[in-house]
């Protein structure tokens, strides 16, 4: 059985299309290097939304072109997904890997259902 | 055992604060007069949001000052709740009563979790 990973069941994206949630993992050892991946599940398909490797001393760093940002504190990672549209509503799974030092461990959360509502367009300013 | 009432588990309110869902009841007979009540559950507290009695021939009629509107077709009621704000996010339960002719039946659904996101204000038009 994999490492335990906890994440909220439901999150609402803001009207600007931003959703934030905490992903917490239960580690028996002291991992120095952790990789966090956000996966979107649609049916039996899983697609990677974003991923980042961070050292426990440093800030969590996602790729520059990533839709995600994040901060870490101990065994908790605060994840923020941006640019969400109504069509992005779905189940977002947090996967945590303890990459270094050995032993390698991996765990996946049960997923966070993110609901996104597209905003009404503002009236044209004449 | 009460009459079976079905309603969706989750509904998203639009960015204008409008949420719609169908409430369907299982009736063994042909009720001529039906009362539909929408209740909001917060903890163990239930508060009435709106209610309407309708005859199967006529349109569903809520009070003029009600936050709800609706239409009916057979044993299905299409409910719409308006003017919702983020603070109104919660579990909305559909209660159906077969008022006439006897026998009287009552049933309650498991509730629809309505999520509401307040829209960002539009920029001032100068």
């Amino acid at each position: 059985k994999g490492m335990h990973v906890a994440q909220p069941a439901v999150v609402l994206a803001s009207s600007r299309g931003v959703a934030s949630f905490v992903c917490e993992y239960g580690s028996s050892g002291n991992a120095a290097e952790v990789r966090v991946t956000v996966l979107r599940q649609a049916g039996s398909q899983m697609t990677e939304v974003c991923a980042a490797t961070y050292t426990v001393e440093d800030e969590l760093a996602f790729l520059d072109d990533s839709t995600c940002t994040g901060t870490s504190s101990g065994n908790k990672v605060n994840l923020t997904i941006q640019g969400l549209r109504a069509m992005d509503t779905g189940l977002y799974i947090c996967k945590v890997e303890l990459m270094y030092p050995p032993p390698y461990y991996v765990g996946m959360g049960n997923g966070t259902q993110i609901y996104v509502i597209d905003p009404e367009p503002c009236p044209d300013s004449d | 055992k009460g009459m079976h009432v079905a309603q969706p588990a989750v509904v998203l309110a639009s960015s204008r604060g409008v949420a719609s869902f169908v409430c369907e009841y299982g009736s063994s007979g042909n009720a001529a007069e039906v009362r539909v009540t929408v209740l909001r559950q917060a903890g163990s507290q239930m508060t009435e949001v709106c209610a309407a009695t309708y005859t199967v021939e006529d349109e569903l009629a809520f009070l003029d000052d009600s936050t709800c509107t609706g239409t009916s077709s057979g044993n299905k009621v299409n409910l719409t709740i308006q003017g919702l704000r983020a603070m109104d996010t919660g579990l909305y339960i559909c209660k159906v009563e077969l008022m006439y002719p006897p026998p009287y039946y009552v049933g309650m659904g498991n509730g629809t979790q309505i999520y509401v996101i307040d829209p960002e204000p539009c920029p001032d038009s100068d």
Partner: antibody, heavy 114, light 111 residues
Framework: EVQLVESGGDLVKPAGSLRLSCVAS????????MNWVRQAPGKGLQWIAG????????SHIDAIKGRFTISRDNAKNTLYLQMNSLRAEDTAVYYC???????WGQGTLVTVSS | QAVLNQPASVSGSLGQRVTISCTGS????????VAWYQQLPGTGPRTLIN???NRASGVPDRFSVSRSGNTATLTISGLQAEDEADYHC???????????FGSGTQLTILG
């Protein structure tokens, strides 16, 4: 497609040296810790060393301590194993692998013999 | 070198089911995960079962695992010709503080 390609294996005399390389492609190499694993002829696999993604921290088994050094160059997407004071018992196929064990290379043969 | 014990070889006919055992101790399999790898002749190992007990990407559900005490078992059902390979198990040893592997099991498909 993820690929790990080892090279540098050769026939070398006891007490000699070799440097193995593992070139990575198809994934963000600098984001992953890496391992070296070896397999002596007719024997099982043996993990010998690991390195974190930035190259600042390493770990290894006692049998290679002071003789082998694991390192990496993220700019070149390459993992290295510097092998000094080689012994006959170091004869094996050497594999590089990502630390989550998702991908392995095809191996490079090191033979230590006089 | 090999700390985990595996049978040197097993065999089975096409379509049959075979099991490969991997026995360790309370400091490795009894306390940690078990992963499984397939090694085709002349190639590097390929992960079959990850440390969380799930099949690696692209691995068919004919491959399954179980564990009881200090012994893990890989079961391959509906044997196919391409399953002929060496199979290795691994775990983390909390006493030795190192990854430990089995000696490998050669699976032969009988014609």
């Amino acid at each position: 497609e993820v690929q790990l390609v080892e090279s540098g294996g050769d026939l070398v005399k006891p007490a000699g040296s070799l440097r193995l390389s593992c070139v990575a492609s198809g994934f963000s190499f600098s984001s992953y810790a890496m391992n070296w694993v070896r397999q002596a002829p007719g024997k099982g696999l043996q993990w010998i060393a690991g390195i974190n993604s930035g190259g600042s921290s390493t770990s290894h088994i006692d049998a290679i301590k002071g003789r082998f050094t694991i390192s990496r160059d993220n700019a070149k997407n390459t993992l290295y194993l510097q092998m000094n004071s080689l012994r006959a018992e170091d004869t094996a196929v050497y594999y590089c692998a990502i630390s989550n064990w998702a991908y392995w290379g095809q191996g490079t043969l090191v033979t230590v013999s006089s | 070198q090999a700390v985990l014990n595996q049978p040197a070889s097993v065999s089975g006919s096409l379509g049959q089911r075979v099991t490969i055992s991997c026995t360790g101790s309370s400091s490795d399999i009894g306390k940690s995960y078990v992963a499984w790898y397939q090694q085709l002749p002349g190639t590097g190992p390929r992960t079959l079962i990850n440390v969380d007990g799930n099949r690696a990407s692209g691995v068919p559900d004919r491959f399954s695992v179980s564990r009881s005490g200090n012994t893990a078992t890989l079961t391959i059902s509906g044997l196919q010709a391409e399953d002929e390979a060496d199979y290795h198990c691994s775990s983390w040893d909390w006493s030795l503080h190192t990854y430990v592997f089995g000696s490998g099991t050669q699976l032969t498909i009988l014609g």
